[in-house]
Interface confidence: low
Amino acid sequence: DFGLDCDEHSTESRCCRYPLTVDFEAFGWDWIIAPKRYKANYCSGECEFVFLQKYPHTHLVHQANPRGSAGPCCTPTKMSPINMLYFNGKEQIIYGKIPAMVVDRCGCS
Amino acid sequence: DFGLDCDEHSTESRCCRYPLTVDFEAFGWDWIIAPKRYKANYCSGECEFVFLQKYPHTHLVHQANPRGSAGPCCTPTKMSPINMLYFNGKEQIIYGKIPAMVVDRCGCS
């Protein structure tokens, strides 16, 4: 599997992973104790033809071109968890691994 | 996990799984021996706000709203394989399980 990495200076218009730091304090998410911010990344860019298509299915749907199918879009194809310390609804402090918080790779699906 | 199922008569505009039969013969994909057609399904519809968002990450990126982030899109969130009989590049007949050929569930990511 392969995915492009870009930054704000990149001239890449195709589907790419961009850096993004999520700041929980800035969102007012005060129930999160740690981390206060983390590198989440995000996906952006164009999915033309078969570029970075994760599944053969994506290509087949493009061929069949059913009514209403919007074509592939640039979306996370590999994600990873982070460990977080947070208050749950009962004001108990929980330490846990929260899945799918970081985008490791982007592709067209 | 939860995903909507629709058909051409559905009154649903949001992200939904629609039926689609892929016909390899119609594509001229004559290297595929069997199946000649199969039910692939596809995803279509709108991803408004937090509807059917698979990951908390999707919501966080929407909150952070970085430049170029296109918002969540309706894409397969669960896929399954099919068994296929086909010619490889060396004209050998191969029987194998091809991953991610059928959409089982759609969501916003």
Partner: antibody
Framework: QVQLVQSGAEVKKPGASVKVSCKAS????????MHWVRQAPGQGLEWMGN????????NYNQRFKARVTMTTDTSTSTAYMELRSLRSDDTAVYYC?????????????????WGQGTLVTVSS | DIQMTQSPSSLSASVGDRVTITCKAS??????LSWFQQKPGKAPKSLIY???RLVDGVPSKFSGSGSGTDFTLTISSLQPEDFATYYC?????????FGAGTKLEIK
């Protein structure tokens, strides 16, 4: 009530650009696709493209793809259509139109509200 | 692109007449067809969607029919305010395409 109010008439020289605005009111701007349609004097209607204000995703008519950019400003509920490298045959009334989903499948919608139109004249 | 052929291009009729305008698609568009009315200097107004469904507030003298490639708009009893140009639109696939229009004039 639901309303789309477009910017005023423009006169441009060939090769210039024009940016037409369409301010929405009376509904949730981000929840509906906005389309742009143009009409040359005495001619029929021609679809240019659309944009979904919620996420900025757009579809353009291939005929205009190299020259058009559609954008939205959700803070002011305004959609914009910019057309570059103007030619005399771009002289037309440009309309924005809201796509209303009545909901019986992916292509089930119609244009329920139109802007009043913006006349763009391209002349040297 | 899907071509929409509209006929006739112009039509003269009298108040009280019943008129029919046709639209033919170059390929099957299911029932994904709308009809519009446009008066000089005004924006188009939606009349019919999904080939035969009347838009809220549009009088029932307007009716639509057809599916696949052949569609019709019928106005059952013409009134002075109905003299205008009428367009069909396919919304089955991008790019959306309009018919060339039918100008309905008073005889």
């Amino acid at each position: 009530q639901v309303q789309l109010v477009q910017s005023g008439a423009e006169v441009k020289k060939p090769g210039a650009s024009v940016k037409v605005s369409c301010k929405a009111s009376g509904y949730s701007f981000t929840g509906y696709f906005m389309h742009w349609v143009r009409q040359a004097p005495g001619q029929g209607l021609e679809w240019m493209g659309n944009i979904y204000p919620y996420n900025g995703v757009s579809n353009y008519n291939q005929r205009f793809k190299a020259r058009v950019t559609m954008t939205t400003d959700t803070s002011t509920s305004t959609a914009y259509m910019e057309l570059r490298s103007l030619r005399s045959d771009d002289t037309a009334v440009y309309y924005c139109a809201r796509r209303y989903y009545y909901g019986t499948g992916p292509a089930d919608w119609y244009f329920d509200v139109w802007g009043q139109g913006t006349l763009v004249t391209v002349s040297s | 692109d899907i071509q929409m052929t509209q006929s006739p291009s112009s039509l003269s009729a009298s108040v009280g007449d019943r008129v029919t305008i046709t639209c033919k698609a170059s390929q099957d568009i299911n029932s994904y067809l709308s009809w519009f009315q446009q008066k000089p200097g005004k924006a188009p107004k939606s009349l019919i969607y999904r080939a035969n469904r009347l838009v809220d507030g549009v009088p029932s003298k307007f009716s639509g029919s057809g599916s696949g490639t052949d569609f019709t708009l019928t106005i059952s009893s013409l009134q002075p305010e109905d003299f205008a140009t009428y367009y069909c639109l396919q919304c089955d696939e991008f790019p959306l395409t309009f018919g060339a229009g039918t100008k309905l004039e008073i005889k």
